[in-house]
């Protein structure tokens, strides 16, 4: 806190100029008008204020503003935003995605801090979706962020939003966000023909069904390993051996690399071994030949 | 190691314009932790503050110099300097350069050699 | 602009004397106080700042004390390079101030 003392003679501020580098805590205080520091806010970003001053200059904001900074003041805070609590934030109402990108170039670079989280907590629920221009935005800043969501959270993003995903935001995402986000970019990107329909949708195949995997296989889309090795270890085993050659094309030869991480040991553990033999891999570990499989969990379905 | 040096005549005539430049070494004069200052003193007589200026070229003066006072900085040569016209006797001095880091209780914690200014004609 | 007055304006005192050092400003001026050093033909050496701390690579028996408008440099046990003149200075407003000095010398 600031000691409140007057303004030296002809130190008054008139405007919010770079000349204010050089005032004390206490000169900045008591010679900055904290309406003309609001109407001049676009400013304060150009001046190389220490932190020190940019603690003063927030601490008259506050007094002005008890309730909250207008969004006018928001979108020109700049460097000052660094300054702000959570607690502060939460008080702000930012509607503006122009604001939002403003306050997030403040922090680019960066990881993202708890001010940055309840900024995009505040904008996202006075929005009430994810839409796809805020999504856009907020990956672009953090491609991490769609998989920092819960899947509750995903719920509300919107298919439409979808479009605005790239490969690289959901490289983070575990199963039970993909479960959530397969569903939607299916539905995103129904309308599309088959191989661009794979490339848009092959992030999300981490959340796809049997069935999905099924289909797939049947539109020579030549999936990559690393995309197999994402996929549902629950979605993988009920596949065939042809289903997988045909869902891998000239990528199988990659399975041998991989037999002993899930999920394909645990497929190549379902497979006949002749089946597996028709590979020309050496897959080892499928069920012997002349052996009998029982699906229990089918068993217990019937019963 | 930051270390400052003062250069300019050592004499200067009366009416005419005294200029002094201090040469930054050891570190950037762009740095945005420093302001630059000059500071001088008479013989025998108390230390006076004249000015500060900031690398973007800002600068803070002594009211009582202002109207004759310039204080400019050459960011490219890590140097800054200061003109002081219609000198005077009353100016000679030993002048310092000196760096003062930009804090809100600060003080000129490296000073230069200092050079002494005669002002006769 | 803010008047700084020393005192006294000379001393004389011996190797291991405590000798204390007083400055006063013409207005409150918070903490925002420097103390230096200069010896004869020398540059002036920060020692103190914001009125009590010791600035980097200045021996301990340097301290300082006061706020306001009092200030005080103490040299706990004066040693044979501490004979020389010591100025205060404010940085509370500008223009920033030096006190005319205080002259320690050998008695």
């Known amino acids: 806190e600031v000691e409140k003392t007057a303004c030296p003679s002809g130190k008054k501020a008139r405007e919010i100029d770079e000349s204010l580098i050089f005032y004390k805590k206490w000169e900045l205080e008591a010679c900055v008008d904290a309406a003309l520091l609001a109407t001049q806010m676009d400013r304060v970003n150009a001046i190389p204020f220490t932190y020190e001053q940019l603690d003063v200059l927030k601490h008259k904001l506050d007094e002005l503003y008890p309730q909250g900074y207008p969004e006018s003041v928001i979108q020109h805070l700049g460097y000052l935003f660094l300054k702000m609590s959570p607690e502060d934030i939460r008080k702000w109402n930012v509607t503006s995605l122009e604001t939002l990108k403003a306050l997030l170039e403040v922090n680019k670079g960066h990881e993202m801090s708890p001010q940055v989280a309840t900024l995009i907590d505040r904008f996202v629920k006075g929005r009430g979706q994810l839409d796809k221009d805020t999504l856009d935005t907020l990956t672009a800043f953090y491609p991490g962020y769609l998989c920092s969501l819960s899947p509750e959270e995903l719920s509300s993003v919107p298919p439409s939003s979808i479009w605005a995903v790239r490969p690289q935001d959901l490289d983070t995402c575990d199963p039970r966000q993909l479960d959530v986000l397969y569903p939607k970019a299916r539905l995103a990107f129904q309308n599309m023909n088959g191989s661009e329909y794979f490339v848009k949708i092959q992030s999300f195949l981490g959340g796809a069904p049997t069935e999905d995997l099924k289909a797939l296989s049947q539109q020579n889309v030549s999936m990559d390993l690393a995309t197999f090795m994402k996929l549902r270890t629950d979605a993988v085993l009920p596949l065939t051996v042809a289903e997988v050659q045909k869902l891998l094309g000239p990528h199988v030869e990659g399975l041998k690399a991989e037999e002993r991480h899930r999920p394909v040991r645990d497929w190549i553990l379902r497979q006949r071994q002749d089946d597996l033999d028709t590979l020309g891999l050496g897959l080892q570990g499928g069920i012997p030949n002349g052996y009998l499989v029982l699906d229990l969990s089918m068993q217990e379905a019937l019963s | 190691q930051v270390q400052l040096q003062e250069s300019g005549p050592g004499l200067v005539k009366p009416s005419e314009t005294l200029s002094l430049t201090c040469t930054v070494s050891?570190?950037?004069?762009?740095?945005?932790?420093?302001?630059w200052g000059w500071i001088r003193q008479p013989p025998g007589k108390c230390l006076e503050w004249i000015g500060n200026?900031?690398?973007?070229?800002?600068?803070n003066y002594n009211p009582s110099l202002k109207s004759r006072v310039t204080i400019s900085v050459d960011t490219s040569k890590n140097q800054f300097s200061l003109k002081l016209s219609s000198v005077t006797a009353a100016d000679t001095a030993v002048y310092y350069c000196?760096?003062?880091?930009?804090?809100?209780?600060?003080?000129?914690?490296?000073w230069g050699q200092g050079t002494m200014v005669t002002v006769s004609s | 602009e803010i008047v700084m007055t020393q005192s006294p304006s000379s001393l004389s005192a011996s190797v291991g004397d405590r000798v204390t050092i007083t400055c006063r400003a013409s207005q409150g001026i918070s903490n925002y106080l420097a103390w230096y050093q200069q010896k004869p033909g020398k540059v002036p050496k920060l020692l103190i700042y914001a009125a009590s701390t010791l600035q980097s690579g200045v021996p301990s028996r340097f301290s300082g004390s006061g706020s306001g408008t009092d200030f005080t440099l103490t040299i706990s046990s004066l040693q044979p390079e501490d004979f020389a003149t010591y100025y205060c200075q404010q940085s509370y407003s500008t223009p920033f101030t030096f006190g005319c000095g205080t002259k320690v010398e050998i008695k």
């Open positions: 000196a760096r003062l880091p930009r804090g809100d209780r600060d003080a000129f914690d490296i």
């Open positions: 050891g570190g950037s004069i762009s740095s945005s932790s420093y302001f």
């Open positions: 200026i900031y690398y973007s070229g800002s600068s």
